[in-house]
């Protein structure tokens, strides 16, 4: 029930990658607008995206205040041009989102291989430490700053002439691997949070191969 021609939002979904967090919902509004509220389990509701005709709301600024907290959002529906109007119970129509804990649930963004350097039969591969929108002391933290040793990277590496992918792992952002002299290798990395049961892995980074500009070779 609710005000005539006003429907409650549904399919409320969190879309979050590296803590950039957007709440999405349906339906596309017809003669209605939406306002979103967000709260921690024990906190007060804060309103965002006032009277919008969008079906998404960027809540990053709120969740980065404490990424280990669990958040709940709700989407209010109002008749367009009459936002004071309420439902039959005297309350605006609204729908709750699922709970969301950024630290446990944000997707890991696609990593990037920053560089690789060969010295003899060793190659040092460095993964870019991506900046997030999480702040501490007025500076933006990197993914490694936020997750610490909870975040590992898996390196897949293979001879350009073969298909079998060897693996290495690091809980920093650097790998040091053994290679055969005179062979060209290709590399791809994946971010992993092993302690998670969902959203454990990122997509693979773009493949980088020796003999391309990111690499450096020294005897």
């Amino acid at each position: 029930s609710g005000t005539t021609n006003t429907v409650a939002a549904y399919n409320l979904t969190w879309k979050s990658t590296n803590f950039k967090t957007i709440l999405e919902w349906e339906p596309k509004p017809v003669n209605q607008v939406y306002t979103v509220q967000i709260s921690t389990k024990s906190g007060d509701w804060k309103s965002k995206c006032f009277y919008t005709t969008d079906t998404e709301c960027d809540l990053t600024d709120e969740i980065v205040k404490d990424v280990k907290q669990t958040y709940l959002a709700r989407v209010f529906s109002y008749p367009a041009g009459n936002v004071e109007s309420t439902g039959s119970a005297g309350e605006p129509l609204y729908e709750n989102s699922p709970e969301f804990t950024p630290y446990l649930e944000t997707n890991l963004g696609q990593p990037t291989i920053q560089s690789f350097e060969q010295v003899g039969t060793k190659v040092n591969v460095t993964v870019e430490d991506e900046r997030t929108l999480v702040r501490r002391n007025n500076t933006f933290l990197s993914l490694r700053d936020v997750f610490g040793k909870d975040l590992i990277y898996t390196l897949y590496y293979w001879k350009s002439s073969s298909s079998g992918k060897k693996t290495a792992k690091t809980n920093t952002n650097e790998f040091l691997i053994d290679v055969d002299k005179g062979e060209n290798y290709c590399f791809s990395v994946q971010a992993v949070i092993p302690s998670r049961t969902v959203n454990r892995k990122s997509t693979d980074s773009p493949v980088e191969c020796m003999g391309q500009e990111k690499g450096e070779f020294r005897e």
Epitope: K149, I152, T154, Y156, S163, G164, K165, K166, T167, A168, K169, T170, N171, I177, D178, S188, Q190, V192, P194, S195, R196, T197, V198, R200, K201, D204
Partner: antibody, heavy 120, light 107 residues
Framework: EVQLVESGGGLVQPGGSLRLSCAAS????????IHWVRQAPGKGLEWVGY????????YYADSVKGRFTISADTSKNTAYLQMNSLRAEDTAVYYC?????????????WGQGTLVTVSS | DIQMTQSPSSLSASVGDRVTITCRAS??????VAWYQQKPGKAPKLLIY???FLYSGVPSRFSGSRSGTDFTLTISSLQPEDFATYYC?????????FGQGTKVEIK
């Protein structure tokens, strides 16, 4: 509860083929790496190969390279070991095992194994 | 490939004995060594990971240590259920490799 169940073992003639399955439950194989390990009668453990189901990447032991193929179907939460050109020395119990891809990354769960006998 | 040389291949011991099994890696593997226990007709079970960390549910009489490329599994006081074969494994690099196994038998 995490479980891995192998099936498909049996008696096969030299030169023949067999396909083993490793059905996983209690976790999503797309988030892990699945390895195959074998054990010949009265012998030790020998690593066969792995697959990362999230990207299809594989690597094989030299002893099976070119003859064995590991694949995975994430919709069925199952990994497979296709064994071709089988030899008497491939006779073994075949286990699948889960690699959590942590920095320490041991095989934390194993299936019960399925016996493959290659004999004429 | 990295070789894991495990010794002894077998040993006889009594309940209550302290038992030590060693594994030597042919090159540096950091702490990426695990120990498994296997009983006849059963799959291996993880005991120790990262050289010295006790896996969940494993009794505290099992412990692991590292000194360079040498790794040790110790059972402080052997129990009847501990008679089995033990394997070390390095997972520092592909391919992961196992030691040859140590069979612990009743004296």
């Amino acid at each position: 509860e995490v479980q891995l169940v192998e099936s498909g073992g049996g008696l096969v003639q030299p030169g023949g083929s067999l396909r083993l399955s490793c059905a996983a439950s209690g976790f999503n194989i797309a988030y892990y790496t699945i390895h195959w390990v074998r054990q010949a009668p009265g012998k030790g453990l020998e690593w066969v190969g792995y697959i990362d189901p999230s990207n299809g990447y594989t690597y094989y032991a030299d002893s099976v390279k070119g003859r064995f193929t590991i694949s995975a179907d994430t919709s069925k939460n199952t990994a497979y070991l296709q064994m071709n050109s089988l030899r008497a020395e491939d006779t073994a119990v075949y286990y699948c095992a889960r690699d959590p891809q942590s920095f320490s990354s041991p095989f934390d769960y194993w299936g019960q194994g399925t016996l493959v006998t290659v004999s004429s | 490939d990295i070789q894991m040389t495990q010794s002894p291949s077998s040993l006889s011991a009594s309940v209550g004995d302290r038992v030590t099994i060693t594994c030597r890696a042919s090159q540096d593997v950091n702490t990426a060594v695990a120990w498994y226990q296997q009983k006849p007709g059963k799959a291996p079970k993880l005991l120790i990971y990262s050289a010295s960390f006790l896996y969940s549910g494993v009794p505290s009489r099992f412990s692991g240590s590292r000194s360079g490329t040498d790794f040790t599994l110790t059972i402080s006081s052997l129990q009847p259920e501990d008679f089995a074969t033990y394997y070390c494994q390095q997972h520092y690099t592909t391919p992961p490799t196992f030691g040859q196994g140590t069979k612990v038998e009743i004296k």
